[in-house]
Amino acid sequence: ARNGDRCPLGPGRCCRLHTVHASLEDLGWADWVLSPREVQVTMCIGACPSQFREANMHAQIKMNLHRLKPDTVPAPCCVPASYNPMVLIQKTDTGVSLQTYDDLLAKDCHCV
Amino acid sequence: ARNGDRCPLGPGRCCRLHTVHASLEDLGWADWVLSPREVQVTMCIGACPSQFREANMHAQIKMNLHRLKPDTVPAPCCVPASYNPMVLIQKTDTGVSLQTYDDLLAKDCHCV
């Protein structure tokens, strides 16, 4: 089987972690978050060719059916396999508080 | 805010559970699975417009950045939120065995 981490489309074309620099305004958070003012958002971007970082059996099925019926079944999609937590300083009804979000920054990626 | 389960693109166009009828041959399993001969594969298919079945904060961020930078950041993607287990009767080196797979059939869907 092809190496599950080797991209057949060329370097950087397949599902992997990308970092996007974003302001509170970009994120739509300016009205409820005070800090940080800017976020290095890590997210999963890229193609999911056959056998590349397949998350599970479902991803294998989806790829096989996509090859058979590309108009009906989409290819697997590059999504977070896990997340890094992050704290936001946010405005609340009772004042300002520090809140930890566990599902904000992608930590690593796979194809589902 | 828009109802997270109401599809603004029209009925059935947004991320939801679909069933695809597939044979062992379709799935590429004919050489190692004996039963079932055919599978009703449940999978997640459909568009992920803003606020529709957003899985988490990461999905919200991704949508906001997609609207800002559509060429750089893809829209959230419709993937399984959970799975239904399924048993396969499979060929092994020592004969035939019953194996349960927990990640084979999508149970419900969300946008990530």
Epitope: L34, S35, P36, N84, P85, M86, V87, L88, I89, V96, S97, L98, T100, L105 | -
Partner: antibody, heavy 118, light 107 residues
């Protein structure tokens, strides 16, 4: 809930090295944005920020003391350390550690007192 | 370093009064200022963040205002438990610096 507790030697002689430990619970220093600062306060006087360590091991020091300060962390055991070399009577103070999210100081320890005396 | 100056070391007030504690930064710090309350024998406690936002749980009689170089902490309807020292702090740039403190005395 979040708690922080400082510990130190209590008394040192001039020229010795001060080793302080901040033991905390209720949060993780592996969380993006989280950090711990050390601040000191001589008796009856104001507050002086000393050093800060971020979740990603980025460290910041007060330039007036930088050559004498070393901050470090052990994320797995929930501890942050501060070393101050060559202490003098001017270092006599109560030393606090405080949790920060980005630049938001929301929990402080009870403080540990250091007396430098020959 | 940015110097934070609290010109009044002591302020005397009565229960029910309104008092304003001021703080001046040696250069523009935007709204990157916090206020802390320290009661005798205790560690500091956050009151105000980003010049005007109360920490969660802080009574609404505490109000922060200002931007740039001039900042004010106002306590309306002063209570006896407000007997404490109040410090401003800038976090616009390193090193973080604190004001010298203003002790509030209750008559």
């Amino acid at each position: 809930q979040v708690t922080l507790k400082e510990s130190g030697p209590g008394i040192l002689q001039p020229s010795q090295t001060l080793s302080l430990t901040c033991s905390f619970s209720g949060f993780s220093l592996s969380t993006s944005g989280m950090g711990v600062s050390w601040i000191r306060q001589p008796s009856g006087k104001g507050l002086e920020w000393l050093a800060h360590i971020y979740w990603d091991d980025d460290k910041r020091y007060n330039p007036s003391l930088k050559s004498r300060l070393t901050i470090s962390k052990d994320t797995s055991s929930n501890r942050v350390f501060l070393k101050i070399t060559s202490v003098d009577t001017a270092d006599t103070a109560t030393y606090y550690c405080a949790r920060t999210g980005w630049d938001f100081f929301d929990y402080w320890g009870q403080g540990t007192t250091l007396t430098v005396s020959s | 370093d940015i110097v934070m100056t609290q010109s009044q070391k002591f302020m005397s007030t009565s229960v029910g009064d309104r008092v304003s504690v001021t703080c001046k930064a040696s250069q523009n710090v935007g709204t990157n200022v916090a206020w802390y309350q320290q009661k005798p024998g205790q560690s500091p406690k956050g009151l105000i963040y980003s010049a005007s936002y109360r920490y969660s749980g802080v009574p609404d009689r505490f109000t922060g205002s200002g931007s740039g170089t001039d900042f004010t902490l106002t306590i309306n309807n002063v209570q006896s438990e407000d007997l404490a020292e109040y410090f401003c702090q800038q976090y616009n740039s390193y090193p973080y610096t604190f004001g010298g403190g203003t002790k509030l005395e209750i008559k």
